[in-house]
Amino acid sequence: MKVLQEPTCVSDYMSISTCEWKMNGPTNCSTELRLLYQLVFLLSEAHTCIPENNGGAGCVCHLLMDDVVSADNYTLDLWAGQQLLWKGSFKPSEHVKPRAPGNLTVHTNVSDTLLLTWSNPYPPDNYLYNHLTYAVNIWSENDPADFRIYNVTYLEPSLRIAASTLKSGISYRARVRAWAQCYNTTWSEWSPSTKWHNSYREPFEQH
């Protein structure tokens, strides 16, 4: 039994880091493998992660962490029974994938303005709370070409757009994702999408 693709890990910078790897053949990850991880710190304890299958030869493990600090460094040991298959390290702050925003809501009752709001996925005491920026994707269910991205570079988890920038009388969907420049993170997954019917009053023409 050998590791074909070494584990790569990403952290949500709060409580979970996810590591994925591939074995050289079909493997029952949960029964055959264990991933041990330990914060490099005096008296810190080693923890064991039981991996799940992720395709035939792929494994994924969700490492639980009480908290994350920028200088944290973890040792990782992948075991098959008594055999050490791979040894490495992981610095969560260098491999951050933020949590996806939640509670995306479209408010359509504000005088021909669409107000989109969502929730920051981090608590206020987390470093990323004040460092997230967002991308909002809006698309038409009827017209695949009607697809747009709005970059929200301010901290407020909201976006205002004129309803008239979208077509009237049809349904749209929106979703939002996050990233943090400070840690050069990857983008989060998209939030669940929300749907609304776009309608607004056409302005009367003056003659």
Epitope: L43, D66, N73
Partner: antibody, heavy 120, light 110 residues
Framework: EVQLVQSGAEVKKPGASVKVSCKAS????????MNWVRQAPGQRLEWMGT????????GYNQKFKGRVTITVDKSASTAYMELSSLRSEDTAVYYC?????????????WGQGTTVTVSS | DIVLTQSPDSLAVSLGERATINCRAS??????????IHWYQQKPGQPPKLLIY???NLESGVPDRFSGSGSGTDFTLTISSLQAEDVATYYC????????FGGGTKVEIK
């Protein structure tokens, strides 16, 4: 209110041992590491060792080469530091201080200090 | 082992003026996953008091004239407006598998 109360001053002869106690109150004793730090007159702070009261795991400053032993009595919420083969340069104020892994070892409460004098 | 060198050894500052204390580590600390920096204040005859943890986090109850910054090998404790009660010796501390203290900086009033 969090309190760490240490035992009283000690005068010892070279070659003897000293055992200093640190009684904790006002928090859950097993939730925090307990550290021992000493300070010789006019000198910098010097870490001696740390114990995790939850499982009695210990880590020591190798400078003391087995002369220091840190223990806990969980039922009494008390930590102990014993230093053996005392020499005159061990004359110092000895402090206990608690720390939290979440804060990565920052010592937020300290005992009042115990003066140990080693003199023939 | 990491060695922490504080500068200056002593510092005389007028009341209301800024005091800046430096702490240099012999190896990169926070940017390399190599540990954590904290700052303490110690007054004569008293145990140390935690001021700043994890480089730049103010401990509860500590006045906000104290702040910490830095990365890599260089860290700084700043007192933005020195008060009489700030006269003390200040220590930086590095922690990972060992705990190390700097040599201390004595702050006095000019």
């Amino acid at each position: 209110e969090v309190q760490l109360v240490q035992s009283g001053a000690e005068v010892k002869k070279p070659g003897a041992s000293v055992k200093v106690s640190c009684k904790a109150s006002g928090y859950t004793f097993t939730d925090y590491y307990m550290n021992w730090v000493r300070q010789a007159p006019g000198q910098r702070l010097e870490w001696m060792g740390t114990i995790n009261p939850y499982n009695a795991g210990t880590g020591y400053n190798q400078k003391f080469k087995g002369r220091v032993t840190i223990t806990v009595d969980k039922s009494a919420s008390t930590a102990y530091m014993e230093l053996s083969s005392l020499r005159s340069e061990d004359t110092a104020v000895y402090y206990c201080a608690r720390s939290l892994l979440r804060r990565r070892g920052a010592m937020d409460y300290w005992g009042q200090g115990t003066t140990v004098t080693v003199s023939s | 082992d990491i060695v922490l060198t504080q500068s200056p050894d002593s510092l005389a500052v007028s009341l209301g003026e800024r005091a800046t204390i430096n702490c240099r580590a012999s190896k990169s600390v926070s940017t390399s996953g190599y540990g954590y920096i904290h700052w303490y204040q110690q007054k004569p005859g008293q145990p140390p008091k935690l001021l700043i943890y994890l480089v730049d986090n103010l401990e509860s109850g500590v006045p906000d004239r104290f702040s910490g910054s830095g990365s890599g090998t260089d860290f700084t404790l700043t007192i933005s407006s020195l008060q009489a009660e700030d006269v003390a010796t200040y220590y930086c501390q590095h922690i990972r598998e060992l705990y190390t203290f700097g040599g201390g900086t004595k702050v006095e009033i000019k």
